[in-house]
């Protein structure tokens, strides 16, 4: 039959950070092409990445419609040049992905310290509220707007001259910490969703230190 050399996709894997979501799979195609379908548990299948030779498909546009829904994808394999061909059961070979719930599973991207400002013995540290690809009323929502209070940030800070780290946490994107006058401090932040069971934490942000351009000092 026309499907003799067609193999089903395998190792279907969701790769998602801040809701940018790509489905990846194997194998690299030899004389075959792929089409991906995605649906919610209760919805209809929607086809994406038609007859592609890629082994990935960007499904962001679909999952951002409702990030709290649970999605399932499947990858169909077709013989190259004969995409009408079906398998022995009368339909093309396909493989299902694991279920994926973006709100609960998307990785938290590496945060960025937007600014820090010293006033006397206090430093205000602000974390950049990164835009996601989730849309509402035509505008892209920030990470905070999507996750609300489910998202907290942890600040790690230490004197430039020592290695002993202190921490602070916040339900917003701002910290206000006490520092010793005349000392320079370094900062790093991490995004955390404490209520999650997987992918709870981001990687740490790049370290920013006082005495560099990003900060501001006021007596």
């Amino acid at each position: 039959s026309g499907t003799t050399n067609t193999v089903a996709a395998y190792n279907l894997t969701w790769k998602s950070t801040n809701f940018k979501t790509i489905l990846e799979w194997e194998p690299k195609p030899v004389n075959q092409v792929y089409t991906v379908q995605i649906s919610t548990k209760s919805g209809d299948w929607k086809s994406k990445c038609f007859y592609t030779t890629d082994t990935e498909c960007d499904l962001t546009d679909e999952i951002v419609k409702d990030v709290k829904q649970t999605y399932l994808a499947r990858v169909f394999s077709y013989p190259a040049g004969n995409v009408e061909s079906t398998g022995s059961a009368g339909e093309p070979l396909y493989e299902n992905s694991p279920e994926f719930t973006p709100y609960l599973e998307t990785n938290l991207g590496q945060p960025t310290i937007q600014s820090f400002e010293q006033v006397g013995t206090k430093v205000n540290v602000t974390v950049e509220d990164e835009r996601t690809l989730v849309r509402k009323n035509g505008t892209f929502l920030t990470l905070r707007q999507v996750f609300g209070k489910d998202l907290i940030y942890t600040l790690y800070y230490w004197k430039s001259s020592s290695s002993g780290k202190k921490t602070a946490k916040t339900n917003t994107n701002e910290f206000l910490i006490d520092v010793d006058k005349g000392e320079n401090y370094c900062f790093s932040v991490q995004a955390v969703i404490p209520s999650r069971t997987v992918n709870r934490k981001s990687t740490d942000s790049p370290v920013e230190c006082m005495g560099q351009e990003k900060g501001e000092f006021r007596e």
């Epitope: 929502l141 916040t170 917003t172 206000l176």
Partner: antibody
Framework: QVQLQESGPGLVKPSQTLSLTCTVS?????????WSWIRQHPGKGLEWIGE???????RYNPSLKSRVTISVDTSKNQFSLKLSSVTAADTAVYYC??????????????????WGKGTTVTVSS | EIVLTQSPGTLSLSPGERATLSCRAS???????LAWYQQKPGQAPRLLIY???SRATGIPDRFSGSGSGTDFTLTISRLEPEDFAVYYC?????????FGGGTKVEIK
């Protein structure tokens, strides 16, 4: 200063949907606070129902989640509560409240610092 | 869910006396997420203490909060006539946010 005012029917029939609106005056609903609904059964303690951010991000009490919808209308400076399939057990005083960030120990945490006066809802046929 | 148990249920005291109210959590609560409210009959609750120990705006310094982990305390150093009310503790760290059952402070 910010004031909150609940409005909606005081009497709802069993199995119907309870609908309440909270109007925010003296400030913008989009100003970085969260907006909550809390209820108090007659002579009893307080029960948190859920909250919403101006962006529409919500959190609900799991015990009510299947029946509750909280929504926000930034153009009207209002947020609303819908509670479906009500029974006599939903008879209570319903409060709306503002959840605003307070500084504590290096960070900011949200507390319910402004409340509406409350509206009594009775579920009865 | 985190259950908050308040004791005593009722506290009968005279004006000028000291009131000590307890709130015990079924599991550890970060101090950052613990609040106390006062409620008078026919009125909405009023935020007194946040972060377990910080007074909200306009709250007299006779009100103080303390504690950590699972045990928290609200103290009213000298009761004024307007302090007779019901007091609730609340945790806002874990959904669902929960309130204690309340302690009624009544005039003896």
């Amino acid at each position: 200063q910010v004031q909150l005012q609940e409005s909606g029917p005081g009497l709802v029939k069993p199995s119907q949907t309870l609908s309440l609106t909270c109007t925010v005056s003296g400030g913008s609903i989009s100003s970085g606070q969260y907006w909550s609904w809390i209820r108090q059964h007659p002579g009893k303690g307080l029960e948190w129902i859920g909250e919403i951010y101006y962006s529409g991000s919500t959190r609900y009490n799991p015990s009510l989640k299947s029946r509750v919808t909280i929504s926000v209308d930034t153009s009207k400076n209002q947020f609303s509560l819908k509670l479906s399939s009500v029974t006599a057990a939903d008879t209570a005083v319903y409060y709306c409240a503002r959840d605003t960030p307070y500084y504590y120990d290096g960070g900011y945490y949200y507390y319910m610092d402004v409340w509406g006066k409350g509206t009594t809802v009775t579920v009865s046929s | 869910e985190i259950v908050l148990t308040q004791s005593p249920g009722t506290l009968s005291l005279s004006p000028g006396e000291r009131a000590t109210l307890s709130c015990r959590a079924s599991q550890s609560v970060s101090s950052s997420y613990l609040a106390w409210y006062q409620q008078k009959p026919g009125q909405a609750p009023r935020l007194l203490i946040y972060g377990a120990s910080s007074r909200a705006t306009g709250i007299p310094d006779r009100f103080s909060g303390s504690g950590s982990g699972t045990d928290f305390t609200l103290t009213i150093s000298r009761l004024e006539p307007e302090d007779f009310a019901v007091y609730y503790c609340q945790q806002v760290g874990v959904v669902p946010y929960t309130f204690g059952g309340g302690t009624k402070v009544e005039i003896k």
